[in-house]
Amino acid sequence: YDFTNCDFEKIKAAYLSTISKDLITYMSGTKSTEFNNTVSCSNRPHCLTEIQSLTFNPTAGCASLAKEMFAMKTKAALAIWCPGYSETQINATQAMKKRRKRKVTTNKCLEQVSQLQGLWRRFNRPLLKQQ
C-alpha cells in the first residue's frame, strides 16, 4: 500500500489520543534504554510503511503483535485516514486470521514495540532532519 495520500495530521492525532499510551503500557517494566533503535524512516509515508510492517507482519520470535490493542487501533486509524487502505487489507487480514497466534510477550516483541515507538516519534516530527 502507498501511504502517500493518507491524512497524516489525523493519524498523528489518533496516535496521540488513542495509541501512544497502549504502546507505553505494553512496554511497562522495560527500561527505555534497554533497546537500541535500529529501524528508521525518512518521511511520513515511509514511517507508516515501516509501522505497518512491524505491527502486522509476524517476525522470528514475535508473531503476536497484530492482536494487541495498539495494533487494532493502528489498523483502524489507517483504515479511516488512508484512502483505499481497507480494501487492500482484506486479503492480507484473512490470511493473517488463519495464522492467528495466542498473545505472548517475548523479549523480541518488546524490542519490536520499542522500534515502533521510535517510528511513531519520527512520524510525529517529520520536519526533523534524519540523524
Epitope: 499510551k21 490493542m69 483502524a76 487502505y85 484473512q94 493473517m96
Partner: antibody, heavy 118, light 108 residues
Framework: QVQLVESGGGLVQPGGSLRLSCAAS????????MSWVRQAPGKGLEWVSN????????YYADSVKGRFTISRDNSKNTLYLQMNSLRAEDTAVYYC???????????WGQGTLVTVSS | DIELTQPPSVSVAPGQTARISCGGD??????VYWYQQKPGQAPVLVIY???KRPSGIPERFSGSNSGNTATLTISGTQAEDEADYYC???????????FGGGTKLTVL
C-alpha cells in the same frame, strides 16, 4: 450528516430469534469498525459485539458468545446482529454504534427495543 | 474483563463543580472515555482519550486519568448537564469495550 438507523426490534419469546439491522449513511461505512451496545430498562450500557471494517475480526461479550452473530454488508452500508436462543435478560434497547479507532464509540443510533417475554 | 466502578449518584448546585469518578485496576495505563446520556436519548461522547473534548462539547467538561482512577469534571455545572454519565475503557486481553455502571448527575 452521519446517521445510524436501527430496525428489527420487537417482542420475541424466550428461545426465539431476531435479526437487527442498522443502516449507515453520511460516512465511509467500509472504513470503520462497528459495534452493538445494549441497555436493559433502567440499567447501564453493555457492549455486546463489534466487527472490523472488512469482517475479518469479530468480538463478543461473554454474555452473548455463541448465541449472537455480528455481520455487515459494506455494499449496502448495513450492520446486522443475529440473535438466537434469546433469554429474558436480553431484553434491552440495542444501539448500533460507530467505533472510532477500535477502542471507543463516537456515533450512536437511536436504538431499537428488543423484548424477550412469554 | 476489567471492572469499572462509578458512584451511582452525584449531586451539585448550579454553577458549582461536579466530579464523577471511575475506578479500575491500573486504569491510568489505558485510555478512558466519557458519555453523557439524557432520558430517552442515545449516549453522546463528551470526553475521549482521557481528557480531550469532541467538537461541540462545552469547555466546562474536562477529564483526567491516573493511577486507578479517572475523573470527569464539569465546571460551572448547568441545569442541562443533568444526565447519566458513563465511563468506558477496554480490556487489553480480550480487547472488549467495558462500561462503568453509570452515575446519575443531579443539578440541585
Amino acid at each position: 450528516q452521519v446517521q445510524l438507523v436501527e430496525s428489527g426490534g420487537g417482542l420475541v419469546q424466550p428461545g426465539g430469534s431476531l435479526r437487527l439491522s442498522c443502516a449507515a449513511s453520511g460516512f465511509t461505512f467500509s472504513s470503520y469498525y462497528m459495534s452493538w451496545v445494549r441497555q436493559a430498562p433502567g440499567k447501564g450500557l453493555e457492549w455486546v459485539s463489534n466487527i472490523s471494517y472488512d469482517s475479518s475480526d469479530t468480538y463478543y461479550a461473554d454474555s452473548v458468545k455463541g448465541r449472537f452473530t455480528i455481520s455487515r454488508d459494506n455494499s449496502k452500508n448495513t450492520l446486522y446482529l443475529q440473535m438466537n436462543s434469546l433469554r429474558a435478560e436480553d431484553t434491552a434497547v440495542y444501539y448500533c454504534a460507530r467505533q472510532q479507532y477500535f477502542d471507543h464509540i463516537d456515533i450512536w443510533g437511536q436504538g431499537t427495543l428488543v423484548t424477550v417475554s412469554s | 474483563d476489567i471492572e469499572l466502578t462509578q458512584p451511582p449518584s452525584v449531586s451539585v448546585a448550579p454553577g458549582q463543580t461536579a466530579r464523577i469518578s471511575c475506578g479500575g485496576d491500573s486504569l491510568g495505563g489505558k485510555y478512558v472515555y466519557w458519555y453523557q446520556q439524557k432520558p430517552g436519548q442515545a449516549p453522546v461522547l463528551v470526553i475521549y482519550g482521557d481528557s480531550k473534548r469532541p467538537s461541540g462539547i462545552p469547555e466546562r467538561f474536562s477529564g483526567s486519568n491516573s493511577g486507578n482512577t479517572a475523573t470527569l469534571t464539569i465546571s460551572g455545572t448547568q441545569a442541562e448537564d443533568e444526565a447519566d454519565y458513563y465511563c468506558q475503557s477496554y480490556d487489553l486481553g480480550s480487547l472488549n469495550l467495558v462500561f462503568g455502571g453509570g452515575t446519575k448527575l443531579t443539578v440541585l
